[in-house]
Amino acid sequence: WELTILHTNDVHSRLEQTSEDSSKCVNASRCMGGVARLFTKVQQIRRAEPNVLLLDAGDQYQGTIWFTVYKGAEVAHFMNALRYDAMALGNHEFDNGVEGLIEPLLKEAKFPILSANIKAKGPLASQISGLYLPYKVLPVGDEVVGIVGYTSKETPFLSNPGTNLVFEDEITALQPEVDKLKTLNVNKIIALGHSGFEMDKLIAQKVRGVDVVVGGHSNTFLYTGNPPSKEVPAGKYPFIVTSDDGRKVPVVQAYAFGKYLGYLKIEFDERGNVISSHGNPILLNSSIPEDPSIKADINKWRIKLDNYSTQELGKTIVYLDGSSQSCRFRECNMGNLICDAMINNNLRHTDEMFWNHVSMCILNGGGIRSPIDERNNGTITWENLAAVLPFGGTFDLVQLKGSTLKKAFEHSVHRYGQSTGEFLQVGGIHVVYDLSRKPGDRVVKLDVLCTKCRVPSYDPLKMDEVYKVILPNFLANGGDGFQMIKDELLRHDSGDQDINVVSTYISKMKVIYPAVEGRIK
């Protein structure tokens, strides 16, 4: 019996088509992805093949103005329109709190939303009961398929799930649910979830009875043969894991941002064994036309976004210096504002011993593309912020050794004076440079804000200690020559859309007046 699994993950509000790098579409003839194009391809496959499932492995939320404005209603609406069969909860589905998940998505979705390792307690338990499920048995043709969901147990550190949701270990939580499916005579089981490729592989290895793993969170691109675009495969598609009980379990992921549609064909025998698995992600490029009815719907929803862009978010009573003459040479108050917003966006009081789990921010000065003049009645709009942060990036959470941070700050000034973008703006860090010294030896003082303290204060950086840092995804991926970050990071979790982080902070503060205060000397 042959099953076709179509899958997406980490779509992050890319409802409209995007450019090849998943930023705003400029030249339509070269744009990719978007729900209208996705629908065309999904329908094409549904018409051609008998047993098809369309699955999403989480993180539909967060990433563009679509989410900022519609807050998840857009996800429910367009996923319903595409007739998704199931979705797993990702960490970003909790970005607007549990209410921001329940009302727009859980209550509106016409497909099951799954996670076996999230357990509700207290007053939330009855409120959320039945709105998401540990597993769902889906009829597919003459057969039935069990889908079990899972979500990163790091979610409390990455989003805002509140205190009434407990995130359990994925493997521990999945096994009894899979066992339950087996007792219900369901022998074809897909684990669909959002914990990253390493955990996907562990689930394939450790959870008895899981036949296929469809994952997300790590934006992993897998491909067999010559890849069709710029993404470099982390392995073959599907990636085959040998389970502890001796079965070959295919593991798949489909990069991110709706650029590809994962396409996996599985042949099962009567016992539910995977006899064969093959496929590849399908690049959703302009050779696939956008479905006209979905496109018309997108255009209708788009109107509200254009209005939102010019509305006031808050006010500044000082000039926000985002000029390259400042931000690439010295501490600039735009850099301070952005870093303060990045830390504020990551306030998570999950442990009494820590005032917060992260205190540090670094930001490449070259990523700040425009100042904001306070003389326009102090008004700050989304449009203004889009000029400052035009690249559609995210502010991510990484774990780095102190020694890596020291290398990063040396790189920051290794060719100082040439107006290059690698000069770092900071938050929760005091750095002193001596530019008379030779490159690679210019950092003379590097103090960082403590986290395991009730009164935050600055302590010298320890080379062997592991620190959490918020930074742009551009830096996490080694951009502006920060190869040491990419090579040496111990953990990387993608965060919220850059503009959204800053706009939320400004809306919260109402009036801002960031200063230059001696963070960089």
Partner: antibody, heavy 114, light 107 residues
Framework: EVQLVQSGAEVKKPGASVKVSCKAS????????MNWVRQAPGQGLEWMGR????????FYSQKFKGRVTMTVDKSTSTVYMELSSLRSEDTAVYYC???????WGQGTTVTVSS | DIQMTQSPSSLSASVGDRVTITCRAS??????LNWLQQKPGKAPKRLIY???SLDSGVPSRFSGSGSGTEYTLTISSLQPEDFATYYC?????????FGGGTKVEIK
């Protein structure tokens, strides 16, 4: 649990036909295939062909084409294999086996003798 | 048709021995290979499917490997109940074809 139950032993004369049945249970019958495999005394296994339960599509090994007919009765989840123009070398145990031979019937002994 | 050449046709071994049986296909069959065990008077039983996946209930001392045209069944430590005849089966293309069998006997 998958179960395949075959009809009883048959003794046939050369030139006659034999029809062996295989009743399946424990799985979604219409979604799969059934194979027929035979084993002559003291010999190895020989694949004869397969039938798709849902629509009756068949694929026969060239060696048996024209002599073998596989049919399906969806209402009773039963598959049949008929072999005609029997000769002494068709004396064998005939097995039905699921799609990828994960489960087998108990076998039906067919003896061709004058 | 794809020919499956199985070797050896028979072998004698003792309990605890490591046993290796090989199947060579006349052309590339991908991963489309099963290993079956048959005891006298019984129907065959599948041990391994898709080259290396172990059927449920089959002891972990059985393992399969290979690719392209060369495939191997290994019994890491032969047990008394393992004395039987073993067959490979390719299902890459019709007609499916079995190897000639390997009889594993007690030394």
């Amino acid at each position: 649990e998958v179960q395949l139950v075959q009809s009883g032993a048959e003794v046939k004369k050369p030139g006659a036909s034999v029809k062996v049945s295989c009743k399946a249970s424990g799985y979604t019958f219409t979604a799969y295939f059934m194979n027929w495999v035979r084993q002559a005394p003291g010999q190895g296994l020989e694949w004869m062909g397969r039938i798709y339960h849902n629509n009756g599509d068949t694929f026969y090994s060239q060696k048996f084409k024209g002599r073998v007919t596989m049919t399906v009765d969806k209402s009773t989840s039963t598959v049949y294999m008929e072999l005609s123009s029997l000769r002494s070398e068709d004396t064998a145990v005939y097995y039905c086996a699921t799609s990828y031979v994960g489960d087998w019937g108990q076998g039906t002994t067919v003896t061709v003798s004058s | 048709d794809i020919q499956m050449t199985q070797s050896p046709s028979s072998l004698s071994a003792s309990v605890g021995d490591r046993v290796t049986i090989t199947c060579r296909a006349s052309q590339d069959i991908g991963d489309s290979l099963n290993w079956l065990q048959q005891k006298p008077g019984k129907a065959p039983k599948r041990l391994i499917y898709a080259t290396s996946s172990l059927d449920s209930g089959v002891p972990s001392r059985f393992s399969g490997s290979g690719s392209g045209t060369e495939y191997t069944l290994t019994i890491s430590s032969l047990q008394p109940e393992d004395f039987a005849t073993y067959y490979c089966l390719q299902y890459a293309s019709f007609p499916w074809t079995f190897g000639g069998g390997t009889k594993v006997e007690i030394k």
